[in-house]
Interface confidence: low
């Protein structure tokens, strides 16, 4: 099989979001309710489902999240802009892993990420986008513990 | 006490228009999500529509049709319903209804004011 | 839209007795219910949330259940003053079907 990779800069993505994390977590109306749930979803993914969900998991930010936020500061939303620029670009990578055939979703991934889209359905649109976004680091942090997994099938 | 109070009822000639007004008091307004509903005389409950406390959202169900906007002011601690097109159809008494602190049960209503009725008639 | 389906319209029951009132979603709500009790000439009261929780100061004599499409609210040792009419009420927000603040058609318990 081929490599499958992602040349995103992770940690640039991560400084971005650091910068805007306090600002964002500050809108957080419901703090002991998560979308993302705290990785308990994302744990229990194979190795052979990780690049369907982070395909699932990049579709649900640039679909949605990023669609449904409407912030108001223009230094926040640049950052947020970079951030789904660089989704944007993952995604189009993983379409090429998708060609490949190297990104199946099989039953359990398809599940996990639904688990997350009803979790952000209970939510007023934009609460839930802030919810959302604040939880990016969980996100983050999902990619970089599977790093490996996801660069090379 | 925390207690809502709608005002603003009364009889209105089919196709006018009538503001009905949600005093809060005992609690923020702001900090909640609030809904209106609507209950022609002997029949049942019918959603109106809900105002976000953070964003300041709205929606409707789909019958309202751009007929009926809600707005709130929150240094006044109140609500507003404006009825415009009004026709006898519309003829109820209006509650505000407040949803409760819980995020998954934010469209559930824990607070009622005693409503105000709206008699639509020639 | 969500369609909320209330059955029995009316239903009489003695004291001491039991009532069973049954609400049906169009779709899954997912436990996203909520009962109300509404007296004439007053305003709804909470009864149940989430489908089972009973609400502050509540008694226990009401017991909600279900979770999907099919909800049951149960009045047992039933009182004088429990004669009222019953809402169900859906509160399950999705974004493709939007709000679902829809409520059914109401139940009219009689207390002989």
């Known amino acids: 099989l081929r490599r499958c990779l992602i040349s995103t800069d992770m940690h640039h993505i991560e400084e971005s979001f650091q910068e805007i994390k306090r600002a964002i977590q500050a809108k957080d109306t419901f703090p002991n309710v998560t979308i993302l749930s705290t990785l308990e979803t994302l744990q229990i993914i194979k190795p052979l489902d990780v690049c369907c969900v982070t395909k699932n998991l990049l579709a649900f930010y640039v679909d949605r999240v990023f669609k449904d936020h409407q912030e108001p500061n223009p230094k926040i939303l640049r950052k947020i802009s970079s951030i789904a620029n660089s989704f944007l670009y993952m995604q189009k990578t993983l379409r090429q892993c998708q060609e490949q055939r190297q990104c199946h979703c099989r039953q359990e991934a398809t599940n996990a990420t639904r688990v997350i889209h009803d979790n952000y359905d209970q939510l007023e649109v934009h609460a839930a986008a802030i919810k959302s976004l604040g939880e990016l680091d969980v996100f983050l942090a999902w990619i970089n513990k599977n790093h490996e997994v996801m660069f090379s099938a | 006490q925390e207690q809502l109070k709608e005002s603003g009822g009364g009889l209105v000639q089919p196709g006018g228009s009538l503001k009905l007004s949600c005093k809060a008091s005992?609690?923020?307004?702001?900090?909640?999500?609030v809904s209106w509903v609507r209950q022609a005389p002997g029949k049942g409950l019918e959603w109106i529509g809900y105002?976000?406390?953070?964003?300041?959202?709205?929606y409707y169900a789909n019958w309202v049709n751009g007929r009926f906007t809600i707005s709130s002011d929150n240094a006044q601690n109140t609500l507003y319903l404006q009825l415009n097109s009004l026709t006898a159809a519309d003829t109820a008494t209006y509650f505000c209804?407040?949803?409760?602190?819980?995020?998954?049960?934010?469209?559930?209503?824990?607070?009622w004011g005693p409503g105000t009725l709206v008699t639509v008639s020639s | 839209d969500i369609v909320m389906t209330q059955t029995p319209a009316s239903v009489e029951a003695a004291v001491g007795g039991t009532v069973t009132i049954k609400c049906q979603a169009s779709?899954?709500?997912?436990?996203?219910l909520s009962w109300y009790q509404q007296k004439p000439g007053q305003r709804p009261k909470l009864l149940i949330y989430?489908?089972?929780n009973l609400a502050s100061g509540v008694s226990s004599r009401f017991k909600g259940s279900g979770s999907g499409t099919e909800f049951t609210l149960t009045i047992s040792d039933l009182e004088c003053a429990d004669a009222a009419t019953y809402y169900c009420?859906?509160?399950?927000?999705?974004?493709?079907?939007?709000?679902?603040?829809?409520f059914g058609g109401g139940t009219e318990v009689v207390v002989k």
């Open positions: 009420q859906s509160y399950y927000y999705s974004s493709s079907s939007g709000y679902g603040n829809v």
């Open positions: 005992g609690f923020d307004l702001s900090s909640y999500g």
């Open positions: 209804a407040r949803g409760s602190g819980y995020v998954y049960y934010g469209y559930t209503y824990d607070l």
């Open positions: 779709q899954s709500i997912y436990r996203y």
């Open positions: 989430g489908a089972s």
């Open positions: 105002i976000d406390p953070v964003f300041g959202s709205t």
